[in-house]
Structure formats: C-alpha cells, structure tokens
C-alpha cells in the first residue's frame, strides 16, 4: 500500500484520508492503529467502533473512508492503516504515518559569555528550549544567517543597541526570543 506522511500539532483535530477515491461498492473498510489495533470497521451499512484509546474521539466517513480524530496527542504518533475489502475479494491498503508535535515553547536566551577583547565585545548567546527537536535560526546584524542554538559574534564599538532574535521552529509552529545588547558590553533583555 501507499504511505503518506502527515505532521500535525498536538491538541488539533485531524482528518486521515487518502487522496484517491475508494473502490466502488466495497464490502468492508477497517482503520488500524500500529498495523494490528483495530479502531473502527464499516460493513453492512454500519460503523463499529472498537475498544481502544480512540473510542469516543474518532469518527468514520464511509463515503470517503476518512477517519476524523479529535484532540490528537503525541501518544497518537503511529502508522495508521486503512484496509478495504473489495467486492471481488481483494484487499487494498493505504498507510498514513502520523507525527504529532507539540507547539514549540518560547525560547529563553542565555548569555554564555560576554567580554571585552581588544576594545571589541565578544558575545556568546545560547537559545534554549526544553528537550525538543527543533530548528534554530538567528536574525540580526550578522554576517550570515546562523542555524544553530548558539550565536557567537564580536562587536566593534558602537553607540546604538543591537538586537538578536532566535527563532525556534518545528514543522507545526515557531516562536521567537530577542536579546538586545547596549554598549559597553552590558545587556538588557526583551
């Protein structure tokens, strides 16, 4: 069967469906969680919802085969399988790999190091969020975009404050944290 990938944010309502139309006049349709845990089965004009962690928060649309899941959580991460038993006795299968991610929290910017080096100001900042697999991007007056949780830069003497923004993102959300630096090698945060 075909495999489709889906990434959604935790707490949202999700529709698992296939991009093609169902076989005509199919006999039975089943949705599985992790290949062997039946969630729901349709046949003879009725849907049967089985005892599972999804009971009460799933609904099947027999027309399209779509499975609606409300309030998905990270524990719902899995490969979901839709199996259709056709009128001719053949089975067809579709797989959807669902990844549920929490929205990223607002990052905290920590000053790891700040010191005068030959009249310049050496600055080392880290962008911290608790145990998440995320992407980091620093923005500000930088020679190039930095995609790392740590920013290291050396500033020449200047009169104005400079701000650096760390953006943390995963495939479902992003949040920013900003650090503003004023000479002489001292800081204020916003």
């Amino acid at each position: 069967g075909r495999l489709v990938h889906m990434t959604v944010v935790s707490g949202s309502n999700v529709t698992l469906n296939i991009s093609e139309s169902l076989p005509e006049n199919y006999k039975q349709l089943t949705w599985f969680y992790t290949f062997d845990q039946k969630i729901v089965e349709w046949d003879s004009g009725k849907s049967k919802y089985f005892e599972s962690k999804f009971k009460g928060r799933v609904r099947l649309d027999p027309q399209s085969g779509a499975l609606y899941i409300s309030k998905v959580q990270k524990e719902d991460n899995s490969t979901y399988v839709m199996r259709v038993l056709k009128k001719d006795g053949y089975e067809q299968e579709w797989k959807i790999k669902l990844q549920v991610l929490d929205p990223v929290p607002k990052p905290v910017i920590k000053i790891e190091k700040r010191e005068d080096v030959d009249d310049n100001c050496y600055l080392k900042l880290s962008c911290v969020i608790p145990g998440e697999s995320v992407n980091y991007t620093w923005y500000g007056e930088l020679p190039k975009e930095i995609q790392n949780s740590v920013l290291e830069t050396t500033l020449k003497p200047h009169k104005h404050s400079r701000c650096y923004t760390c953006q943390v993102s995963n495939s479902v959300s992003s949040k920013n944290g900003t650090f503003c630096f004023s000479p002489p090698c001292t800081a204020a945060r916003s």
């Epitope: 003879s44 089985f50 053949y90």
Partner: antibody, heavy 121, light 107 residues
Framework: QVQLVQSGAEVKKPGAAVKVSCKAS????????ISWVRQAPGQGLEWMGW????????NNAQKFQGRVTMTTDTSSSTAYMELRSLGSDDTAVYYC??????????????WGQGTLVTVSS | DIQMTQSPSSVSASVGDRVTITCRAS??????LAWSQQKPGKAPKALIY???SLQSGVPSRFSGSGSGTDFTLTISSLQPEDFATYYC?????????FGQGTKLEIK
Amino acid sequence: QVQLVQSGAEVKKPGAAVKVSCKASGYTFTAYGISWVRQAPGQGLEWMGWISAYDGDTNNAQKFQGRVTMTTDTSSSTAYMELRSLGSDDTAVYYCARDRYSSSSGYFDYWGQGTLVTVSS
Amino acid sequence: DIQMTQSPSSVSASVGDRVTITCRASQDISSWLAWSQQKPGKAPKALIYAASSLQSGVPSRFSGSGSGTDFTLTISSLQPEDFATYYCQQANSFPYTFGQGTKLEIK
C-alpha cells in the same frame, strides 16, 4: 501475539451435547469474528458456522441448523460452540478460527489448536 | 453450496522442486479464495487469502493466483517443512466450503 486456546478433549454418548470453548488473547476480541470448522478422522475440513464477537450475529451451515449454538463472552474473550444430539459421525476435531474482519469475510488468519470430540456408546 | 475440487489429491516431490496445486470452484467466486496448510495432528495454518495475498509471516516461496473458477497454489522451491496437506477454501458465500485437500509427500 494472537492466540486461540481451545478446551480439552471430550468423550460423549450419542444423543448428548458438547460445548467447546475457544479463549482468545493478544488482540481486541470484539474486533474480529470467529468461525468453527471441524475435521472427522482422516477427512477434510468442514465449516460449521460463524459468530461476530462484536454483536453476536451468527450464520450457521444448513447442515447444523437447529443443532448448533455459537456464543461469545466478551468479558473473558471466549467463543463457545455447542453441538447437540450428537451422533457417531460427529466424532471429529473441532477448530475455532479467527476471521480477518468483525463481520465474516471467510478469510481466517489464526486457528485454535483443536478439540477432539469422540462420540461413543 | 459451492463445490471445491483440488487436484492432484496427492503429489510426491523433492526438496527444491517447484510444485503447483490447482483448485476449481463449481461457480464463479471472483477472488474469494484462501489456501491453508495442515500438518498431521496439527491445526491448519493460513497461507494465502484473496487468491494471491500472502498471510503475514508466510514465506514468499508460497504464491497464489487465479480468479473466477480456477486457482493455483505454487511453492517455488520446496523446503522440508512444506510437506503437508494443502486445502483451498472459498469465501465467496455461506456456507464456506473447502477442497478435499492435496497431500504433498516426500519423493
């Protein structure tokens, strides 16, 4: 892993009844149907009937109509097959088999180990 | 009732051989056919359903084909553990019926 464990061998007198059990484990019992199949000594396989563990719906082979009763107990994940008015030609090994669907598709994916029922006076 | 007829009723073959068993239905059953394997004193084991779909865990040397009334089970390269009796079964309509079995013996 999926297992269907059947009750032990039985010896019955002609005219008596026998009740064979099939205890399921390793899956959600109500999500699949159970068929009963028997095999007389040295003979082939004969389908007796099917029951939905979801709602108790049944379909029996005409040959056994009125003589067989299939039931399930969802609290213990057990299917039962009772055969009445036993005759010597009912001597056979009785198997339960899990259907791939909760309604009958006729495709069996797991079988119990079998229960030998001997009918003898 | 739909009659299922298997041929041959027994066949002798050697390890490594390719073996084909055929099954004929008395009426069109589309692809509603299953194959099972049974060893002496043991329960049947599901091999193939929907005429050609392999049950989970069944070695790929087993394959099924056909539709309508004529079906075949092929074992591409016989292994010692394949010597057993094979049954076809129609799942098209109640009552489900089985073929009489084909006994595969060591030559």
